[in-house]
Amino acid sequence: AFGISGVQKYTRALHDSSITGISPITEYLASLSTYNDQSITFALEDESYEIYVEDLKKDEKKDKVLLSYYESQHPSNESGDGVDGKMLMVTLSPTKDFWLHANNKEHSVELHKCEKPLPDQAFFVLHNMHSNCVSFECKTDPGVFIGVKDNHLALIKVDSSENLCTENILFKLSET
């Protein structure tokens, strides 16, 4: 895993500028792990970052991700139930200027360096469909979630609400 000290030194100012016209309602650093307690790690390889899902050695430090949470208004004409609703959206940044992106064409999750305003591919609708676990749904592709496939993160299509609890799209956030 690459040195995350840069993330630890994130200043408040870094994310004070507005993203897609809004500022995050809250931000914090957390490690990301799967439902089965494998860690999500990030490694610099050939000048680009790779994302891995792996078991860490006993004293190995977990990589941290800066999660920025945004409130998104969902108008009633889209919601289908006659009421305006709010959703939580999140962006995930494991190191300065890099964000997780949904590549819907390749069904992959990638780390891209980008400037603000961040593209829609960097935003994920937050679900907590299972006790103390979260899921990340692509803003750009409803019904498609970040999931685990072959020890990597991938985009996984969820075709019914019963499948929202499949373990491979459930993640745990930990601040320790």
């Epitope: 939580l88 907590n128 469909m129 103390n132």
Partner: antibody, heavy 121, light 107 residues
Framework: QVQLQESGPGLVKPSETLSLTCTVS????????VHWIRQPPGKGLEWIGV???????SYNSALMSRVTISVDTSKNQFSLKLSSVTAADTAVYYC???????????????WGQGTLVTVSS | DIQMTQSPSSLSASVGDRVTITCLAS??????LAWYQQKPGKSPKLLIY???RLADGVPSRFSGSGSGTDFTLTISSLQPEDFATYYC?????????FGQGTKVEIK
Amino acid sequence: QVQLQESGPGLVKPSETLSLTCTVSGFSLSKYGVHWIRQPPGKGLEWIGVLRAGGTISYNSALMSRVTISVDTSKNQFSLKLSSVTAADTAVYYCARDHYYYSSFGGFASWGQGTLVTVSS
Amino acid sequence: DIQMTQSPSSLSASVGDRVTITCLASQTIATWLAWYQQKPGKSPKLLIYAATRLADGVPSRFSGSGSGTDFTLTISSLQPEDFATYYCQQLYNTPYTFGQGTKVEIK
């Protein structure tokens, strides 16, 4: 427009099962999590459990062995059953809806008016 | 389970006073904290969510602050309709536990 309404018997005998229903309108149970909370007379609030937007259910471990939450989406209703009740289960029982779609992180924005259930023989 | 400890359990104040209620979580809950107001015989009403966000229709004299384990609800200038009991609640982990409540009474 958003409404939640609890209903059920106000008196339950010890050792029997308490059964309550919450009827909702103005929103979809497929988008919002809904919760049961109770409050004994003169005391604080206790979270009982949640029916999440995806259909999964989580319970308070302190009550888990006795509690069941279920849903009838066709009637826009979800229900609470609490078995083997004692006088300590006497409380006002509330149903409530999440503030956010798909997530409970924003607290409970809408509440029913509550229904008092007394456990007594 | 995460324990939520509110203080004080009760307080007496006058109209126009600045009132502060604190809530301490037994472990970090990021900013996933809500504050509710409850009047006798009524359902709780959401005041603040995500520690600092004012719920719809709530007067701006109410504000919330804090993150991690320490949180505060402030009423900048107490009004007659603010005399009630206030509860904090963590939404970081199930079970979603509440503080024991703070009763704000008229001095």
